[in-house]
């Protein structure tokens, strides 16, 4: 009933009812991408598939240019998994060379951009030191939580190093949000 | 109101309203597994507790023979955590023996089976290389995301090695889904 | 409509409809902890920010004294991430000393307390061995699942070692729940 319900006039309507099926929702899946030059301490954003395979956007939740656009204000559950993989960890080389043993790391950040606000807001961060003994390593970072978002907010997923992202399968690296 | 709402006849009903309490939901918890022979490159499915302790199924969401049965079409949030544990990592032994340093791995896949479709669909995968230095290791892999499912779809959780799954506690290894 | 709907008297009302916007919800974020003495085998509970920054509680979901209070019975999705970090892993020191190589571990438990029930119930546990080669390590543990809760239940997050919890950023360590 598109967020409206007809009730007897004597009843106080505290909040509109709405059908669950018409709530904004999206599940985006990974596509291959190679990093462009990016500024130090500024993590690049991932680009996503939004309509093929398992990916979809619905009910005015749109995807454009690395961003999920929030079409209406409310509480959203937002989630992402990024699977990373690498050939070797420099950590072991640094260790052997006798230099300070500062491990490498992999990081995922789900970021909110509000046009009226100068700085992006980091909603969720998953960060992990990587100091693998093996020559080939791979591992996922999963994030998910609920946030109050405003119409017009934009969501993106940033990573510490795009070249380490496993883009080979749509079930390994993904990003989604839905209105509760 | 079981997905129906009575509204004045002049109103356009875009989508049925339905009470949240009658939506299909399940939370399944780990039980001790019987390792079965499985074909190479075909991960075995876990079976689950569906009614004791923290586990439940409700509103026509049924569990049978390792599968969660989807009773109605819609968007579902699906999740699982599998905790793995092992005594040693063969990785270190392989390394010491001078063989190629290919790390072992642990993998969880949430799979959808549709009877009318010949191949299962992998919805979610969490995969991690394991090359632990310690003689005893343990770690969880968590997955969760939203998918559009059809009535009659079946969901299962597959793992790379059933013998590494920690089945000792219902809070360590679990599987669930709920209609949004 | 606050859980009520007016329907023709001849209709069977199976379950009340209610507006999504008035459901109990909370997202809590990390604050600096004061390490407290705790009994052996009894993990300390974290306390949380509940109103500043990204944190909020709404619709009668209240936070008090390390607990989220459940204001109405129903099925809730509960989640938490705790990011741990440490300077060194004693594991390597233990190994070098020739003692049994039992790795250290980090553990998160989401616990339910019901006043009428003598023992807390562990709903979710994420536990991981830590045997890092690097001198500085950090990693998150994420948990999330659905549970049937009763009005008056209390939820808390317990960790194996408060001193290892990364409290520096609200996006790294958090705890939330919402009525489905």
């Amino acid at each position: 009933l598109k967020g409206q319900e007809f009730a007897p006039s004597h009843q106080q309507v505290y909040a509109p009812l709405r059908a669950d099926g018409d709530k904004p929702r999206a599940h985006l899946t990974v596509v291959r991408q190679t990093p462009t030059q990016h500024f130090k301490n500024q993590f690049p954003a991932l680009h996503w598939e939004h309509e093929l395979g398992l990916a979809f956007t619905k009910n005015r939740m749109n995807y454009t240019n690395k961003f999920l656009l929030i079409p209406e204000s409310g509480d959203y559950f937002i989630y992402s998994q990024v699977t990373f993989r690498g050939m070797t960890s420099e950590c072991s080389e640094i260790r052997q060379a006798g230099r300070p043993n500062k491990p490498d790391s992999i990081t995922v950040v789900i970021t909110k951009v509000t046009d009226s606000y100068p700085e992006p807001t980091q909603l969720l961060m998953g960060t992990k030191s990587v100091c693998e003994v093996g020559s080939n390593w791979f591992q996922p970072i999963y994030l998910g939580a609920m946030f109050s978002l405003q119409e017009g907010d934009k969501l993106m997923v940033n990573v510490s190093d795009i070249s380490l992202v496993d883009y080979t399968k749509e079930d390994k690296t993904f990003f989604g949000a839905f209105l509760l | 109101l079981k997905g129906q709402e009575f509204a004045p006849s002049h109103q356009q009903v875009y989508a049925p309203l339905r009470a949240d309490g009658d939506k299909p939901r399940a939370h399944l918890t780990v039980v001790r597994q019987t390792p079965t022979q499985h074909f190479k490159n075909q991960f075995p499915a876990l079976h689950w507790e569906h009614e004791l302790g923290l586990a439940f199924t409700k509103n026509r969401m049924n569990y049978t023979n390792k599968f969660l049965l989807i009773p109605e079409s819609g968007d579902y949030f699906i999740y699982s955590q599998v905790t793995f544990r092992g005594m040693t990592s063969e990785c270190s032994e392989i390394r010491q023996a001078g063989r190629p340093n290919k790390p072992d791995s642990i993998t969880v896949v949430i799979t959808k089976v549709t009877d009318s479709y010949p191949e299962p669909t992998q919805l979610l995968m969490g995969t991690k290389s394991v090359c632990e230095v310690g003689s005893n290791w343990f770690q969880p892999i968590y997955l969760g995301a939203m998918f559009s499912l059809q009535e009659g779809d079946k969901l299962m959780v597959n793992v790379s090695d059933i013998s590494l799954v920690d089945y000792t506690k219902e809070d360590k290894t679990f599987f669930g889904a709920f209609l949004l | 409509l606050k859980g009520q709907e007016f329907a023709p008297s001849h209709q069977q009302v199976y379950a009340p409809l209610r507006a999504d916007g008035d459901k109990p919800r909370a997202h809590l974020t990390v604050v600096r902890q004061t390490p407290t003495q705790h009994f052996k085998n009894q993990f300390p509970a974290l306390h949380w920010e509940h109103e500043l920054g990204l944190a909020f509680t709404k619709n009668r979901m209240n936070y008090t004294n390390k607990f989220l209070l459940i204001p109405e019975s129903g099925d809730y999705f509960i989640y938490s991430q705790v990011t741990f970090r440490g300077m060194t892993s004693e594991c390597s020191e233990i190994r070098q000393a020739g003692r049994p190589n039992k790795p250290d571990s980090i553990t998160v438990v989401i616990t339910k307390v019901t006043d009428s029930y003598p023992e807390p119930t562990q709903l979710l546990m994420g536990t991981k061995s830590v045997c890092e080669v690097g001198s500085n390590w950090f990693q998150p543990i994420y948990l999330g699942a659905m549970f049937s809760l009763q009005e008056g239940d209390k939820l808390m997050v317990n960790v194996s070692d408060i001193s290892l919890v990364d409290y520096t950023k609200e996006d790294k360590t958090f705890f939330g729940a919402f009525l489905l």
């Epitope: 596509v31 291959r32 991408q33 190679t34 990093p35 462009t36 030059q37 680009h47 598939e49 309509e51 093929l52 993989r85 690498g86 050939m87 070249s163 380490l164 883009y167 080979t168 | - | -």
Partner: antibody, heavy 119, light 108 residues
Framework: EVQLVESGGGLVKPGGSLRLSCAAF????????MNWVRQAPGKGLEWVGL??????????DYAAPVKGRFTISRDDSKNMLYLQMNSLKTEDTAVYYC??????????WGQGTLVTVSS | ENVLTQSPGTLSLSPGERATLSCRAS???????LVWYQKKPGQAPRLLIY???SRATGIPDRFSGSGSGTDFTLTISRLEPEDFAVYYC?????????FGQGTKLEIK
């Protein structure tokens, strides 16, 4: 600034061999898949083949007309891409371009090198 | 292989007019891997659009791309004299990568 510079083109007889090189500047070469593309005189663009990054096992893939005759390789330490062309045919006459293959994102091209196969 | 068919083969228009170029694929593929190039004699192809709709660096905003699945379009809203060239679409989602046969945009 991203730059790709091809070299090694020239005149060769049918059945002969030639090795093209492509020097890459201004980006992390080892992360990027690389393609060879060609354009025969008066014809359209034609994909020749690709080599993936080492992270993706460095595997190669080729268009049907050149499979078994052409080999793509790379030397990440020198930021160099190569195309070894054997058993050349007159229909291999074209301008050969090396290009980046970044997946989603901007791809870059060299200026091309002319290969003429003629007796 | 995924065959890309461009239409029309030749498009005769005057400066200031709007040009609409079509690219149709024989198989569905991700729009992330659809690009449009401009090619002039003696020059390397110039990337105009990547990901079906994202303008490459330095490309004027009169160039726009759209489409998904199997049908893609390049639009030049107001033709300038320097826009007359051959335009190619390419997919690189599935191997073998393929180009369309090209659309020649000529001055009327």
């Amino acid at each position: 600034e991203v730059q790709l510079v091809e070299s090694g083109g020239g005149l060769v007889k049918p059945g002969g061999s030639l090795r093209l090189s492509c020097a890459a500047f201004g980006f992390t070469f080892s992360n990027v898949w690389m393609n060879w593309v060609r354009q025969a005189p008066g014809k359209g663009l034609e994909w020749v083949g690709l080599i993936k990054s080492k992270t993706d096992a460095g595997t190669t893939d080729y268009a049907a007309p050149v499979k078994g005759r052409f080999t793509i390789s790379r030397d990440d330490s020198k930021n160099m891409l190569y195309l070894q062309m054997n058993s050349l045919k007159t229909e291999d006459t074209a301008v050969y371009y090396c290009t980046t293959d970044r997946g989603w994102g901007e791809n870059y091209w060299g200026q091309g090198t002319l290969v003429t196969v003629s007796s | 292989e995924n065959v890309l068919t461009q239409s029309p083969g030749t498009l005769s228009l005057s400066p200031g007019e709007r040009a609409t170029l079509s690219c149709r694929a024989s198989q569905i593929f991700s729009s992330s891997y659809l690009v449009w190039y401009q090619k002039k004699p003696g020059q390397a192809p110039r990337l105009l659009i990547y990901g079906a709709s994202s303008r490459a660096t330095g490309i004027p905003d009169r160039f726009s791309g759209s489409g998904s699945g199997t049908d893609f379009t390049l639009t030049i809203s107001r033709l300038e004299p320097e826009d007359f060239a051959v335009y190619y679409c390419q997919q690189y989602g599935n191997s073998p990568y393929t180009f369309g046969q090209g659309t020649k945009l000529e001055i009327k």
